[in-house]
C-alpha cells in the first residue's frame, strides 16, 4: 500500500482542517488508514483522524483543531496499521479556505432598492472576522445569460443595488462567497442561494 498523491490540507481558520490524498489503488480508508496530527506546542496532544473514502482510491479527513493562530504548525503522520506511509506538516494560516457566509436575505421593501444582507461566518474574536471581503452572484432563473457578480470590498456584509438594474417581473437568485486578502485565501464555497421575485415601478416616460 502506497500513497500516490500526498495529503494536501486546507483550514477554515477556525476549528476544522480538511486533508485529502490518493492511494495507489482502491482503499477502504476508514478501516485501513489513520491520520495522526499534533499541534507543535508545549500543551498539545496527538489526535487521530479516521478518514472517509472520496472516490475509489481517494481519502479525506476532517481534522478538529484548536482555534487557529497564525504561528500554528501541525505534524501529520499517515499510518496503515503499523506502517508509516507518509510524514509531513501543515501550517493552517498558509492554506486557508474561509467558511461560507450564511443567512443570505434579500430585502425588497426598501423603495426601489434591493438590500442583500448575510452573516459573517466568523466570531468577532477570530482574525478573519474583520478581513473578509465578498462576491455576490445574482442570476435570473429564466435567462442563463443574465448572470452578474458584485464585488463587496468593504467589511459590511451587505449589498445595495437598484431594483431597476435587474429585469422586472421575473425571479432571481443570489448567493455569496468570501475570501481574505490578508492570508491570500482561496474563495469559500458559495452560500445557499436565496430566491426573490423582482418587481419595481417603471418610471413614467417624459413626452
Amino acid at each position: 500500500m502506497k500513497v500516490l498523491q500526498e495529503p494536501t490540507c486546507v483550514s477554515d481558520y477556525m476549528s476544522i482542517s480538511t486533508c485529502e490524498w490518493k492511494m495507489n489503488g482502491p482503499t477502504n480508508c476508514s478501516t485501513e488508514l489513520r491520520l495522526l496530527y499534533q499541534l507543535v506546542f508545549l500543551l498539545s496532544e496527538a489526535h487521530t483522524c479516521i478518514p472517509e473514502n472520496n472516490g475509489g482510491a481517494g481519502c479525506v479527513c476532517h481534522l478538529l483543531m484548536d482555534d487557529v493562530v497564525s504561528a500554528d504548525n501541525y505534524t501529520l503522520d499517515l499510518w496503515a496499521g503499523q506502517q508509516l506511509l507518509w510524514k509531513g506538516s501543515f501550517k493552517p494560516s498558509e492554506h486557508v479556505k474561509p467558511r461560507a457566509p450564511g443567512n443570505l436575505t434579500v430585502h425588497t421593501n426598501v423603495s426601489d432598492t434591493l438590500l442583500l444582507t448575510w452573516s459573517n461566518p466568523y466570531p468577532p474574536d477570530n482574525y478573519l472576522y474583520n478581513h473578509l471581503t465578498y462576491a455576490v452572484n445574482i442570476w435570473s432563473e429564466n435567462d442563463p445569460a443574465d448572470f452578474r457578480i458584485y464585488n463587496v470590498t468593504y467589511l459590511e456584509p451587505s449589498l445595495r443595488i437598484a431594483a431597476s438594474t435587474l429585469k422586472s417581473g421575473i425571479s432571481y437568485r443570489a448567493r455569496v462567497r468570501a475570501w481574505a486578502q490578508c492570508y491570500n485565501t482561496t474563495w469559500s464555497e458559495w452560500s445557499p442561494s436565496t430566491k426573490w421575485h423582482n418587481s419595481y415601478r417603471e418610471p413614467f416616460e417624459q413626452h
Epitope: D66, A71, P123
Partner: antibody, heavy 115, light 109 residues
C-alpha cells in the same frame, strides 16, 4: 465579546491554600489553551501555569508541586489550586487566553499571603 | 530557561518623540513567538505586537516591532499622552515555556 473574570483571591496565611477561578465567555472555551500569569506588587509579569485543550499542563519552576491548574469545559471555567502558599506568592493573578502569546486577559484577582 | 532582558529600565521622553525599546534574549528565539505588551497602572496588560512585528487588532500603526534571533525592538514613532506606560516583551519556547522581560517604563520627561 471575550470576557475573562477571575475570583477567589484574598488574604491567606503562609502555608495556607486558596483556589482561584476564571469564568470565560464570548468564545469557544474548549478549543483554547488557558493560562495564569501573576504580578507581584510593583514588579513585572510572571507566567505561572498553562493548560491545553486536552488537559496537558505546564508550570513555572517557582510553583511546581504546589499549584495545580485545571479546567471544566462544561462550565467554561479555569481554576488554580494553590497550596503551601508563601509570602512571595503575593500578587495579582491574571487569567489569560492564548497560545504562544496572550491576546486576552482578565482584570486579575489579588492574592495576599501574610501572617 | 530563556531570559529576556529589556533596556532601558526607564525611558524619559516627551509627547511627540520617538521611543525605542529593546528586548534581548539569552538564546535565540523564534520571531513567531515574540510578543510585546503595554500595561498601565491598575490595568491588565494589552497585547501590542505578536510574531515580533505583527500588530494586534486595534493597535495604532505608530507601534511597530522588529528584530530576530536574540535582539528585538519595539518602536513608538510618535508618543501620544496615552502611550506612557510599562512595556513588556514575552517569548514562548517549545521546551522552556513562556517568559517575560522585566519591563521598560516609558515616562513623561
Amino acid at each position: 465579546e471575550v470576557q475573562l473574570v477571575e475570583s477567589g483571591g484574598g488574604l491567606v496565611h503562609p502555608g495556607g491554600s486558596l483556589r482561584l477561578s476564571c469564568a470565560a465567555s464570548g468564545f469557544t472555551f474548549s478549543r483554547n489553551a488557558m493560562f495564569w500569569v501573576r504580578q507581584a506588587p510593583g514588579k513585572g509579569l510572571e507566567w505561572v501555569s498553562g493548560i491545553g485543550t486536552g488537559g496537558a499542563t505546564s508550570y513555572a519552576d517557582s510553583v511546581k508541586g504546589r499549584f495545580t491548574i485545571s479546567r471544566d469545559n462544561a462550565k467554561n471555567s479555569l481554576y488554580l489550586q494553590m497550596n503551601s502558599l508563601r509570602a512571595e506568592d503575593t500578587a495579582v493573578y491574571y487569567c489569560a487566553r492564548g497560545r504562544y502569546y496572550f491576546p486576552w486577559w482578565g482584570q486579575g484577582t489579588l492574592v495576599t499571603v501574610s501572617s | 530557561e530563556i531570559v529576556l532582558t529589556q533596556s532601558p529600565g526607564t525611558l524619559s521622553l516627551s509627547p511627540g518623540e520617538r521611543a525605542t525599546l529593546s528586548c534581548r534574549a539569552s538564546q535565540s528565539v523564534s520571531s513567531s513567538y515574540l510578543a510585546w505588551y503595554q500595561q498601565k497602572p491598575g490595568q491588565a496588560p494589552r497585547l501590542l505586537i505578536f510574531g515580533a512585528s505583527s500588530r494586534a487588532p486595534g493597535i495604532p500603526d505608530r507601534f511597530s516591532g522588529s528584530g530576530s534571533g536574540t535582539d528585538f525592538t519595539l518602536t513608538i514613532s510618535r508618543l501620544e499622552p496615552e502611550d506612557f506606560a510599562v512595556y513588556y516583551c514575552q517569548q514562548y519556547d517549545h521546551s522552556a515555556g513562556w517568559t517575560f522581560g522585566q519591563g521598560t517604563k516609558v515616562e513623561i520627561k
